[in-house]
Amino acid sequence: VDKGFINIFPMINTTVFVNDGENVDLIVEYEAFPKPEHQQWIYMNRTFTDKWEDYPKSENESNIRYVSELHLTRLKGTEGGTYTFLVSNSDVNAAIAFNVYVNTKPEILTYDRLVNGMLQCVAAGFPEPTIDWYFCPGTEQRCSASVLPVDVQTLNSSGPPFGKLVVQSSIDSSAFKHNGTVECKAYNDVGKTSAYFNFAFKEQIHPH
């Protein structure tokens, strides 16, 4: 008697990048003999009850080819992670995992003046945001003079970066001899956000 088998072929790359709010379909083709008995898609130990379709290439008794599609709609930044397709028949089990990264525009989480005179900006997004600092003389909010940060840290670099990455950057405000506004600009491939901070230290956040 022939031993059963299952072979799974991803029809897209198993590492997927998708922009916040967009849709993505995870599609696999698989060969199974005997016929598959159980199929499921799993995310974070939760099984999808809908949002997926599974069907054979043909309905002949000799058919061994199948497709399964998981339809992910309007993905949020919090919905990145590992999505796994599992299939079994009477002889074997098989699985394939897709790592889904959701690209998100940076948001500025905090913007503070520390007691030691440092200005600190913390931003989150994916891919990892870059934070640039600019000084705006007087009351202008067109900031051109760039300021080098004293310290830059990625705060949550441990573990797989499926969620947003948090970056902290600091500058020394004692370098500024004139009244004005400081801009903290956080940006990545998706977009940019700025926070403006004047010397009365009133915070305003302006997404662009």
């Epitope: 029809m11 599609i27 379709e53 339809h71």
Partner: antibody, heavy 117, light 108 residues
Framework: EVQLLESGGGLVQPGGSLRLSCAAS????????MNWVRQAPGKGLEWVSG????????SYADSVKGRFTISRDNSKNTLYLQMNSLRAEDTAVYYC??????????WGQGTLVTVSS | DIQMTQSPSSLSASVGDRVAITCRAS??????LNWYQQKPGKAPKLLIY???KLEDGVPSRFSGSGTGTDFTLTIRSLQPEDFASYFC??????????FGPGTKVEIK
């Protein structure tokens, strides 16, 4: 044997409506995503619309969005395309297709829609 | 939408020739690329799916290759029944599935 048979094409005036049907046989229709693809005379192929197996999700080409509606009746093994506000540029042979993954593995013979005054 | 281009738009070849048709996407589409054959007055027929997988019943002289933006359909030894038009199709963006303009293969 998988068969897809389109009907409902014909001559219609600009601004008019038409409903195409596609009768499916030889497979369990309710399990498969389905699509409409069209081909203007002497031109290339253009995907028009798609629908999931349950009928719960649909998608459209920008050129027909808001004018065309795809639907299906799994109990009748039939796919539909309701076409409203028809324009001369909608003149084409309309094909009903079955999806396998992201490819169209079976096609009907097509039905001709002519929009002309 | 992702734009698809094909080259050449037409070619003349003889029975037994090796023929290659190229398809290029305006952005990376991974391997979401399918090839179809169409004869005059007939519906298209799927030849290759997922860039390189041969559809059931299609002769092995047809093959597909490529990933990203550049793809090729190759007919190893052209047969009389292969004279037809060939279309590539991307299905990376859904909705937004698009076809190439086609390549007509004629008898020399």
């Amino acid at each position: 044997e998988v068969q897809l048979l389109e009907s409902g094409g014909g001559l219609v005036q600009p601004g008019g409506s038409l409903r195409l049907s596609c009768a499916a046989s030889g497979f369990t229709f309710s399990r498969y995503p389905m699509n409409w693809v069209r081909q203007a005379p002497g031109k290339g192929l253009e995907w028009v619309s798609g629908i999931r197996s349950s009928g719960g999700a649909t998608s459209y080409a920008d050129s027909v969005k808001g004018r065309f509606t795809i639907s299906r009746d799994n109990s009748k093994n039939t796919l539909y395309l309701q076409m409203n506000s028809l324009r001369a540029e909608d003149t084409a042979v309309y094909y009903c297709t079955r999806s396998f993954g992201r490819a169209f593995d079976y096609w009907g013979q097509g039905t001709l829609v002519t929009v002309s005054s | 939408d992702i734009q698809m281009t094909q080259s050449p738009s037409s070619l003349s070849a003889s029975v037994g020739d090796r023929v290659a048709i190229t398809c290029r996407a305006s952005q990376s589409i991974d391997t979401y690329l399918n090839w179809y054959q169409q004869k005059p007055g007939k519906a298209p027929k799927l030849l290759i799916y997922a860039a390189s997988k041969l559809e059931d019943g299609v002769p092995s002289r047809f093959s597909g290759s490529g990933t990203g933006t550049d793809f090729t359909l190759t007919i190893r030894s052209l047969q009389p029944e292969d004279f037809a038009s060939y279309f590539c199709q991307q299905s990376y963006s859904s909705p937004g599935i698009t076809f190439g303009p086609g390549t007509k293969v004629e008898i020399k």
